[in-house]
């Protein structure tokens, strides 16, 4: 069991504990910031990011950003709490296993965002249709 | 009954070495990812590293990354966590913690073992 000395420590955001009492391990992400990307016009894409971080706060969940302007397209992976707003931007997927993009509006570019918590889910990105939980089929499907 | 029980702490120069261990048993370790955490005084946890099941994959803490690394060895149900390059900002107490496959929670910590880092 956890020793109890560390659940009597300092009350911080760094533990975070289920009604047990028992310490949420931090998930672990992709983590490249913001990287040139050449996914376009695909149903989903891998991160191609080589760096896997152990997200600093239990309490974070996988980001992934993918923006496209004039000049370029660009992927952003990174560790983030669902409870502030990332990009001006609610995290209301947050608790889903896979990153399925959703189209955001911003002026001048089209941008998507996902979140999710599993292991390295920001990795596989998804711009799929059929994972859209916006598709009232699969609502159907997830609630009955 | 699970068990583990870190060792290999104590005082250490700025810039020196250290090799903690966690021995382990009461379960099948090799099925369970392991982790280092510490906490130091009066601060809460830190999340240092991890290492999957069969030790193919490594996971750092930034704080760390370059100077630690976790490697377990399952015939001896061991981990280990190698520190180089110590700082004083690495005195902690360390502990080592199991998670289950599929669990988001720690189910079993050892009682940890205290590295002091002074000049």
């Known amino acids: 069991t956890i020793p109890p000395h560390v659940q009597k420590s300092v009350n911080n955001d760094m533990i975070v504990t289920d009604n047990n009492g028992a310490v949420k391990f931090p998930q672990l992400c992709k983590f490249c910031d913001v990287r040139f990307s050449t996914c376009d016009n695909q149903k989903s894409c891998m991160s191609n990011c080589s760096i896997t971080s152990i997200c600093e706060k239990p309490q974070e969940v996988c980001v992934a950003v993918w923006r496209k302007n004039d000049e370029n397209i660009t992927l952003e992976t990174v560790c983030h709490d669902p409870k502030l707003p990332y990009h001006d931007f609610i995290l209301e997927d947050a608790a889903s296993p896979k990153c399925i993009m959703k189209e955001k509006k911003k002026p001048g570019e089209t941008f998507f965002m996902c979140s999710c918590s599993s292991d390295e889910c920001n990795d596989n990105i998804i711009f799929s249709e059929e994972y859209n939980t916006s598709n009232p089929d699969l609502l159907l499907v997830i609630f009955q | 009954e699970v068990q583990l029980l870190e060792s290999g702490g104590g005082l250490v120069q700025p810039g020196g070495s250290l090799r903690l261990s966690c021995a382990a048993s009461?379960?099948?370790?090799?099925?369970?990812r392991m982790w280092w955490v510490r906490q130091a005084p009066g601060k809460g946890l830190e999340w240092v590293s991890?290492?999957?099941?069969?030790?193919?994959?490594?996971y750092y803490a930034d704080s760390v990354k370059g100077r630690f690394t976790i490697s377990r060895d399952n015939s001896k149900n061991t981990l280990y966590l190698q520190m180089n390059s110590l700082r004083a900002e690495d005195t902690a107490v360390y502990y080592c913690?199991?998670?289950?496959?599929?669990?988001?929670?720690?189910?079993?910590w050892g009682q940890g073992t205290l590295v002091t880092v002074s000049s």
């Open positions: 913690a199991k998670q289950s496959t599929g669990s988001a929670t720690s189910d079993y």
């Open positions: 009461g379960f099948t370790f090799a099925e369970d």
């Open positions: 991890a290492i999957d099941p069969q030790g193919q994959h490594t």
